[in-house]
């Protein structure tokens, strides 16, 4: 069985802080998925992008808001599985020759996903066919099912292409890389922020912002581009010293990507450890795959 959370190429040590983004080398984030949604039921066709993380040969973990249609405002309508394409092993969007693309067999949004405050912002995509695993396509580990989540000051990595304007065809995005912040996968290093500090930072701003117990925050008080670069739904991964594996502790949810660089506006992430049981139940994983997926 292939292992999770162990890229063939060692990720950089976490002593030196990264401000802003930096190019990822091929194979650094083998779990990284590009999710392309093309809603052809609408005129004009709606089209958007997000990130996700490979959990097994057949399952992608992402944020629910990436897979929700905006056609209805107060109703959570998942996009049709027929409108979803997932790219794995993708490094440079100008060259998809080494990438694997797969259509979706199922799209599963958390039943309690709330569009007003993004509580329970987590979802799964089941791939039509299992993807072949290798040096550039490997799963990430799930955390232990516990409510605490990552501790403040722990450093994690988030990767993404920063696709910002999808008014182009998928081929243009994948082949030419137009309308992306970067052609090459970028990553940033961010510290986890205490729940109290993050809650206070959002409460100090007028509005209906709610940092729930199903979320955690990361970023720097002084702001900067590091809060913008992760595509929605991408995994916030932390290295677990005990198991020597990388673990998906969070998913890019809201906050930072909307107000990039603002002082004391932290990125808010879905706390994956609160959903491990739900994820395993949905994936209906056999015992062996559970061993593979969950950090021991």
């Amino acid at each position: 069985l292939p292992v999770c959370g162990q890229p063939s190429r060692a990720l950089p040590n976490l002593v030196k802080r990264i401000i802003g983004g930096r190019n990822a080398e091929l194979g650094l984030f083998p779990w990284q998925a590009l999710i392309v949604v093309e809603d052809t039921s609408r005129i004009p066709n709606d089209k958007w992008f997000g990130s996700g993380a490979l959990l097994s040969e057949s399952w992608i973990l992402t944020a629910a808001h990436v897979l929700r249609s905006q056609r209805r405002d107060n109703t959570v309508i998942p996009v049709s599985k027929d409108h979803v394409t997932v790219y794995l092993g993708l490094h440079d969007v100008r060259d998809k020759s080494g990438a694997v693309n797969s259509s979706a067999a199922r799209v599963v949004l958390h039943p309690d996903f709330n569009i007003q405050n993004y509580n329970h912002d987590i979802a799964l995509v089941q791939l039509q066919e299992p993807v072949p695993l290798g040096a550039h396509v490997m799963p990430i580990c799930l955390p232990r099912p516990e409510p605490e989540g990552p501790a403040p000051h722990m450093l994690g990595l988030v990767a993404g292409w920063g696709i910002s304007n999808p008014n182009v065809t998928v081929d243009e995005i994948i082949i030419s890389g137009t309308r992306t912040l970067s052609d090459v996968l970028q990553y940033v290093k961010l510290p986890v922020v205490s729940h109290a500090e993050c809650k206070a930072s959002y409460e100090s701003r007028s509005g209906n912002y709610s940092v729930t117990e199903n979320m955690f925050c990361a970023g720097y008080y002084e702001g900067g581009k590091d809060t913008c670069l992760g595509d929605s739904g991408g995994a916030f991964v932390i290295f677990d010293e005990m198991s020597q594996r990388w673990v998906a502790q969070g998913l890019v949810s809201w906050g930072g990507p909307e107000e990039c660089g603002s002082k004391q506006v932290y990125g808010v992430y879905t706390k994956v450890s609160n959903y491990v049981d739900w994820l395993l139940e949905e994936m209906n994983s056999p015992r062996g795959v559970r061993e593979l997926q969950v950090e021991r």
């Epitope: 004009p44 066709n45 709606d46 089209k47 958007w48 808001h65 905006q70 056609r71 209805r72 405002d73 107060n74 109703t75 309508i77 569009i115 007003q116 405050n117 993004y118 304007n165 999808p166 008014n167 007028s206 509005g207 209906n208 912002y209 809201w254 990507p257 909307e258």
Partner: antibody
């Protein structure tokens, strides 16, 4: 609290272009689409279309295809309405409203006067 | 496009008395998802519109319970049990079921 704050009144000549902004605050911006609604002087409301704030894809009602363009500056939480080649009949108040269909919160409106 | 017809055009009501506004659509507003996207808003003089009711009968937060919405298919009604001075303005219904969304012509509520 949830707020939509629009740019100030505009006085333009026929043939010119106007760009109206609608700064949103108090909610997760990319969670809701943004509609644009026109109200001619002394008249009722007419829905112009909406923009998906997550994908950036605009949808226009038939009467507003061509000279009208919706756009976004997501990092500034600001949708825009641009009207090109202004005509006298574009004189109206333009409202932004949160949601593609719900339109539950409205901006204060931007008055556009087109006169030679 | 779906035509939304509101009646009456103008409504003069004494404070404390009830009021009723009708809104009829040219086709059923029941969507394939089982919901009916019929909404009501109030535009007070010189102000921007404010939504009062969505999905036929659900009251927006802060809207007094003297307002009620009802109806189904093509016939809808907004009722005010006891009109107050702050209720004056123009009431619009609109539908969000069939593209493009369309508004009724409006009903002006005046205080006698």
């Amino acid at each position: 609290q949830i707020q939509l704050v629009q740019s100030g009144p505009e006085l333009k000549k026929p043939g010119e272009t106007v760009k109206i902004s609608c700064k949103a605050s108090g909610y997760i911006f990319t969670s809701y689409g943004m509609s644009w609604v026109r109200q001619a002087p002394g008249k009722g409301l007419k829905w112009m279309g909406w923009i998906n704030t997550y994908s950036g894809v605009p949808t226009y009602a038939d009467d507003f295809k061509g000279r009208f363009a919706f756009s976004l500056e997501t990092s500034a939480r600001t949708p825009y309405l641009q009207i090109n080649n202004l005509k006298n009949e574009d004189t109206a108040t333009y409202f932004c409203a949160r949601g593609g269909e719900a339109m539950d919160y409205w901006g204060q409106g931007t008055s556009v006067t087109v006169s030679s | 496009d779906v035509l939304m017809t509101q009646t009456p055009l103008t409504l003069s009501v004494t404070i404390g008395q009830p009021a009723s506004i009708s809104c009829k659509s040219s086709q059923s507003l029941l969507d394939s998802d089982g919901k009916t996207y019929l909404n009501w808003l109030l535009q007070r003089p010189g102000q921007s519109p404010k939504r009062l009711i969505y999905l036929v009968s659900k009251l927006d937060s802060g809207v007094p319970d003297r307002f009620t919405g009802s109806g189904s298919g093509t016939d809808f009604t907004l009722k005010i049990s006891r009109v107050e001075a702050e209720d004056l303005g123009v009431y619009y219904c609109w539908q969000g079921t069939h593209f493009p969304w369309t508004f009724g012509g409006g009903t002006k509520l005046e205080i006698k």
